[in-house]
C-alpha cells in the first residue's frame, strides 16, 4: 500500500531457475524408407538449454530435418511456390519464405509438382504442421525451482524468496502454499487460465511475475514475494506474425567427408520471470 | 508529456524476436594444401543462436580454426612473441594474449620465425584480420520481427506493439510506417546514422529503443510504442579494449581417436532491445 | 546525493563482457578400463558460452558421463533407490530424482546392489560429488572486461564506463584504480568477502553492481560508475534447494549408427551485472 511519507526505491533482482522432469516421447521414425515407432527419453539436457538471465525455455514439440547437405534441390512446394517453366524462377532470387537461392531452373519436386531449384541445405525443410498432440506434452508435469535474490541498494537491504524454514519438497499453490518457489508447469498455465496441452503444440511465452512490495520500516517490516502468472504471447495472432514460440537450431556433423546437419525446429514455452516492486522506508 | 496529477508507473516488458533471411557466402577454403573457392548458404540456424531475453545476435563475419587438437606447438608469432633461444620461454607461463602454456622451448613456427612452444589447442589460432568485406554482409537485407508485450501492474493494464489490424508484410519506416514492427537490419543502421557494411566486419552492438509513453486515463487514452535506434558499442575504442563485437565458440568431434575441435571466432551485431516508459493515470 | 529540485530519471543500460584466461586441468581419465592422468588446456571457447545480456558464465568444475545411449539399465543406487524384488519397482513410474522411466523389474546394479531397471540414457549419471579442489580452480586468475553503455533518454544524455583516456592493461582495484573496468575474478570474490576456491567446487552466482549517480546539470556535472560486488546465491542453502550453480548439457554424436551423447554437468560462477542509478537535471 502507498505510504506517501516513505522513500521508495525500485528492486534490483537476480534470478536462478532449475527445471526437473523426464519426458517419454513416442513418434514415427523413418529410416531407409521404413517407418517404425520410435521411443525415447528426454531429460533436462535434451529439452532445455543453458540460459542466463530471467528466462528459461522448455521444448515441448519439434520437427526434425535430418541429413541436410549444401547442394541444389527443388524448394518446398508451399502455397504459390510451384512453377511450370524456368520463366517462373529467377536466378539469384532469395524468397524470404524460401530457404535458398534460386538457380533459375524449374525442376520436379515429386511425381506431380515442380518448383524452383535452389542452392540450399537440402532436402529443404518440409513446412509441415507441428505434431499434435505435442511430443513432449508430459512437460506439463515438470517442475521449476525459482530462486530470486533482491536488493534495495539505497536502503542497504537484501533478501531472497527462499527462506531457511522452507521445505524443498513443496509445490506452489496459490492458497495452500503461496510462498513455495517450486512450480509445476501445468499449474502455472492453469493459474493463468491457459491450456498447457494446447500451447505445447505451437509454443508460447508465459510470464511469471514476482512482485515485492516491501515495507522496510522496522516497526512494520514486511518483505515477501507475491507470484502471479500471465501469458505473454498473443494466442490470437495472425499467421503472418508467427504465432507461438519456436526457433531453429542445427547439429552439424561430417559423413563421408561431407558437412551435414540435422535441423531442429523446436517449439516450446519460454518462461519470462518478471521481478518488480519497491522498497519503502521512512 | 508530463501530467503532474497522474500516478506514474514504470513499464514491465517481455520481448520476442524472429530473424528472417538467407546469406550467400563465398570464401577461399583450403583443403589438403589446395585453396579453392567455397560457396555456401547460411540460414537462421547457421547465423543466429537460440537466445532469450531482450537481445538477439546475427553473425556477419567469422574466422575459423579447423581441426585443432590438444598437443604441443609453436604459439602464434604476434608482435613481441618471437624468440631466438629457450631462455625467452618460461616453462608453465601463461601469457594472457597467448592461447596455451609454455613448455620452455623455443621452436620454429615457420621457415623464418621461431616462437615459444605451448601446450594448447593446436595449431593455435592465427591472429588474422576479420575478412573485409564481411562474409555475411548481405545480412543487411535480413529482417527482424519484434513482438513486445507490456504491462503496468499497478494500473492493471496490458498491451502489445502488434495490433490485430496490422499487416505482416509491412516494413518499418520512420515516416510511412512507424508502427510496423518488422525491421530491415540495414534500415536500423541507417536510422542510427551507421554504415552496416562497415560495422559487419568487426561486429558491434545496436540498440533498438522502444519507448512507451502511456496515458491510461479513459478520456485521453494513448498507449503506442515509439521506436528509435542508436549504436551502443564505441566505434572509436582503443584496440586494447576489444572494439566491435565477437566471441569464440567451438564444435567438438573425434577423429582417429583424438578429440578435435573447430574454433569459430564469430563477429556480428548484437541487437539490444531496450524497452522503457511509463503509464500514467489520474 | 539527493537534490530535490532535480528531475530524476532511471538509467537505460547495455552491457558487453569479454573473459580472458587459460586453465590447465589435470584429472584421472578412464579409457578401456585403464585409468591414466589426463591433462588438458581450457580456453574461453571451452569454459564459457556465447551469452547475451547482463550475465556471463565461467565453468569452474564438471562431471562427465561419457558414451550414454538410450536403452534399459539399472538406475543409480542413491539413498532409498535400492530394491530386492520387482514389487519395489513400478512400471511407467518416473521418479523426479531418477533419470528414467521404470520398467517394473529389479535388476543388479553391481555385485552387491540391485536397483529398479529404467528406460533412460544409460549408463545413468553417477551422483558423485563435484571434484574437490575444482578442476578449473585457476579461473581465479581469469579477467573480465566489462563495457557498459548508459542512456538517460529524457535528458538525451549518453555515456559509457570506458573513457578514451583509460589504459587497457589496468586491473580494477577499489583504492588504486576504481575506474578500471577489467576485473580479476579472484579479486571480485575477495571484495565480496568470498573464497573463490571454495565456491568454484559447487558453483555460485556473483553480482557485479554498477551504480551510476549522475548529476547532469552543467555547473556541477558528474557521471561516473561505482562498482561493488556481492554474492547472490545462498551459501547456506538446504540440499533440497540445489545449492551452488550448475546445469547439464549434452554433446550428441553417432557411433556404429547408434545415437550417443556425452552428458556434462557444468558447475561454475554466473556473474550477473546489475546496473542501476539515476540521472538528475534541473
Amino acid at each position: 500500500s502507498d505510504k506517501l511519507y516513505q522513500r521508495k526505491e525500485p528492486v534490483i533482482s537476480s534470478v536462478h531457475t532449475k527445471v526437473k522432469g523426464i519426458a517419454e516421447v513416442t513418434e514415427n521414425v523413418t529410416e531407409g524408407g521404413v517407418t517404425k515407432l520410435g521411443h525415447s527419453i528426454f531429460d533436462t539436457a535434451d529439452y532445455t538449454f543453458p540460459l542466463q538471465g530471467n528466462s528459461f525455455f522448455v521444448m515441448t514439440n519439434y520437427v526434425k530435418s535430418e541429413g541436410q547437405v549444401q547442394t541444389l534441390c527443388p524448394e518446398y512446394p508451399r502455397r504459390g511456390a510451384q512453377c511450370s517453366s524456368d520463366r517462373r524462377c529467377k536466378k539469384g532470387w532469395m524468397d524470404p519464405q524460401s530457404k535458398g537461392i534460386q538457380t533459375g531452373r524449374c525442376v520436379p519436386y515429386d511425381k506431380t509438382r515442380k518448383t524452383c531449384e535452389v542452392s540450399a541445405w537440402c532436402p529443404t525443410e518440409e513446412e509441415k504442421e507441428a505434431p499434435r498432440p505435442a511430443l513432449l506434452r508430459s512437460a506439463e508435469n515438470f517442475t521449476v525451482l525459482i530462486k530470486n535474490n533482491i536488493h534495495f541498494p539505497g536502503h542497504n537491504y537484501t533478501t531472497r524468496n527462499i527462506l531457511p524454514t522452507m521445505n524443498g519438497s513443496c509445490t506452489f499453490h496459490k492458497t495452500w502454499d503461496p510462498q513455495c518457489s517450486i512450480f509445476r508447469l501445468g499449474d502455472i498455465f492453469q493459474e493463468a487460465g491457459e491450456n498447457f496441452t494446447e500451447v505445447a503444440v505451437q509454443g508460447g511465452i508465459m510470464g511469471i511475475e514476482i512482485y515485492w512490495d516491501c515495507n522496510l520500516d522496522s516497526w512494520s517490516h514486511h518483505c515477501r514475494p507475491r507470484y502471479s502468472f500471465r501469458r505473454l504471447d498473443d494466442k490470437n495472432m495472425d499467421e503472418s506474425f508467427v504465432p507461438g514460440y519456436n526457433f531453429r537450431y542445427a547439429k552439424y556433423y561430417k559423413e563421408n567427408n561431407v558437412e551435414k546437419r540435422t535441423l531442429i525446429k523446436a517449439f516450446g514455452i519460454r518462461f519470462d520471470i518478471l521481478v518488480f516492486g519497491t522498497g519503502g522506508k521512512f | 508529456s508530463d501530467k503532474l496529477y497522474q500516478r506514474k508507473e514504470p513499464v514491465i516488458s517481455s520481448v520476442h524476436t524472429k530473424v528472417k533471411g538467407i546469406a550467400e557466402v563465398t570464401e577461399n577454403v583450403t583443403e589438403g594444401g589446395v585453396t579453392k573457392l567455397g560457396h555456401s548458404i547460411f540460414d537462421t540456424a547457421d547465423y543466429t543462436f537460440p537466445l532469450q531475453g531482450n537481445s538477439f545476435f546475427v553473425m556477419t563475419n567469422y574466422v575459423k580454426s579447423e581441426g585443432q587438437v590438444q598437443t604441443l606447438c609453436p604459439e602464434y608469432p604476434r608482435r613481441g612473441a618471437q624468440c631466438s633461444s629457450d631462455r625467452r620461454c618460461k616453462k608453465g607461463w601463461m601469457d594472457p594474449q597467448s592461447k596455451g602454456i609454455q613448455t620452455g622451448r623455443c621452436v620454429p613456427y615457420d621457415k623464418t620465425r621461431k616462437t615459444c612452444e605451448v601446450s594448447a589447442w593446436c595449431p593455435t589460432e592465427e591472429e588474422k584480420e576479420a575478412p573485409r568485406p564481411a562474409l555475411l554482409r548481405s545480412a543487411e537485407n535480413f529482417t527482424v520481427l519484434i513482438k513486445n508485450n507490456i504491462h503496468f501492474p499497478g494500473h492493471n493494464y496490458t498491451t502489445r506493439n502488434i495490433l490485430p489490424t496490422m499487416n505482416g508484410s509491412c516494413t518499418f519506416h520512420k515516416t510511412w510506417d512507424p508502427q510496423c514492427s518488422i525491421f530491415r537490419l540495414g534500415d536500423i543502421f541507417q536510422e542510427a546514422g551507421e554504415n552496416f557494411t562497415e560495422v559487419a566486419v568487426q561486429g558491434g552492438i545496436m540498440g533498438i529503443e522502444i519507448y512507451w509513453d502511456c496515458n491510461l486515463d479513459s478520456w485521453s487514452h494513448h498507449c503506442r510504442p515509439r521506436y528509435s535506434f542508436r549504436r551502443l558499442d564505441d566505434k572509436n575504442m582503443d584496440e586494447s579494449f576489444v572494439p566491435g563485437y565477437n566471441f569464440r565458440y567451438a564444435k567438438y568431434y573425434k577423429e582417429n581417436n583424438v578429440e578435435k575441435r573447430t574454433l569459430i571466432k564469430a563477429f556480428g551485431i548484437r541487437f539490444d532491445i531496450l524497452v522503457f516508459g511509463t503509464g500514467g493515470k489520474f | 546525493s539527493d537534490k530535490l529540485y532535480q528531475r530524476k530519471e532511471p538509467v537505460i543500460s547495455s552491457v558487453h563482457t569479454k573473459v580472458k584466461g587459460i586453465a590447465e586441468v589435470t584429472e584421472n581419465v578412464t579409457e578401456g578400463g585403464v585409468t591414466k592422468l589426463g591433462h588438458s588446456i581450457f580456453d574461453t571457447a571451452d569454459y564459457t558460452f556465447p551469452l547475451q545480456g547482463n550475465s556471463f558464465f565461467v565453468m569452474t568444475n564438471y562431471v562427465k558421463s561419457e558414451g550414454q545411449v538410450q536403452t534399459l539399465c539399472p538406475e543409480y543406487p542413491r539413498r532409498g533407490a535400492q530394491c530386492s524384488s520387482d514389487r519395489r519397482c513400478k512400471k511407467g513410474w518416473m521418479d523426479p530424482q531418477s533419470k528414467g522411466i521404470q520398467t517394473g523389474r529389479c535388476v543388479p546394479y553391481d555385485k552387491t546392489r540391485k536397483t529398479c531397471e529404467v528406460s533412460a540414457w544409460c549408463p545413468t549419471e553417477e551422483e558423485k560429488e563435484a571434484p574437490r579442489p575444482a578442476l578449473l580452480r585457476s579461473a581465479e586468475n581469469f579477467t573480465v572486461l566489462i563495457k557498459n553503455n548508459i542512456h538517460f533518454p529524457g535528458h538525451n544524455y549518453t555515456t559509457r564506463n570506458i573513457l578514451p583516456t583509460m589504459n587497457g592493461s589496468c586491473t580494477f582495484h577499489k583504492t588504486w584504480d576504481p575506474q578500471c573496468s577489467i576485473f580479476r575474478l579472484g579479486d571480485i570474490f575477495q571484495e565480496a568477502g568470498e573464497n573463490f576456491t571454495e565456491v568454484a567446487v559447487q558453483g555460485g552466482i556473483m553480482g557485479i553492481e554498477i551504480y551510476w549517480d549522475c548529476n547532469l546539470d552543467s555547473w556541477s556535472h558528474h557521471c561516473r560508475p561505482r562498482y561493488s560486488f556481492r554474492r547472490l546465491d545462498d551459501k547456506n542453502m538446504d540440499e533440497s534447494f540445489v545449492p551452488g550453480y550448475n546445469f547439464r548439457y549434452a554433446k550428441y554424436y553417432k557411433e556404429n549408427n547408434v545415437e550417443k551423447r556425452t552428458l556434462i554437468k557444468a558447475f561454475g560462477i554466473r556473474f550477473d551485472i546489475l546496473v542501476f542509478g539515476t540521472g538528475g537535471k534541473f
Partner: nanobody
Framework: EVQLVKSGGGLVQAGGSLRLSCAAS????????MAWYRQAPGKQRELVAD???????NYADSVNGRFTISRDNVRNTVYLQMNGLKPEDTAVYYC??????????????WGQGTQVTVSS
C-alpha cells in the same frame, strides 16, 4: 623407459613400394608430433615427412605425391608408405617423436635407423 620400435625397410627395385612403421612404447603422457627423417651416405639428415597429433602432414618437396605419412593414435604408431621409389631415396630412415613424459615435460626421441635401398 620410452622407446621407438621400428619395422620395415629393406631392398626394393625402382618404382616399387615399401612401408615403414614405428611404435612408441613405455610409460608416457602423450605423443605429439611424429616424423620420418633420412640420411644418405655423406649427406646431412633431412626431414622426409611429419605429422601432428591432429593428422596435419608436411612433406619434403622431393617425396611429395609419392610418400604418405599416417599415424594410429591408439597404438602410438607412425607409418610411412613409400610408393614410386627412386634410387635417390636410398638412405637410412629414422623415426622421430616428440613425447610428453608428463604434462609439459616433452622430450625428443629417435628410433634406430632402418636401411632402405632402391636399386635401379
Amino acid at each position: 623407459e620410452v622407446q621407438l620400435v621400428k619395422s620395415g625397410g629393406g631392398l626394393v627395385q625402382a618404382g616399387g613400394s615399401l612401408r615403414l612403421s614405428c611404435a612408441a612404447s613405455g610409460s608416457f603422457f602423450r605423443v605429439n608430433n611424429m616424423a620420418w627423417y633420412r640420411q644418405a651416405p655423406g649427406k646431412q639428415r633431412e626431414l622426409v615427412a611429419d605429422i601432428t597429433r591432429g593428422d596435419r602432414t608436411n612433406y619434403a618437396d622431393s617425396v611429395n605425391g609419392r610418400f604418405t605419412i599416417s599415424r594410429d593414435n591408439v597404438r602410438n604408431t607412425v607409418y610411412l608408405q613409400m610408393n614410386g621409389l627412386k634410387p635417390e631415396d636410398t638412405a637410412v630412415y629414422y623415426c622421430y617423436a616428440r613425447i610428453e613424459l608428463g604434462p609439459l615435460v616433452p622430450r625428443d626421441y629417435w628410433g634406430q635407423g632402418t636401411q632402405v635401398t632402391v636399386s635401379s
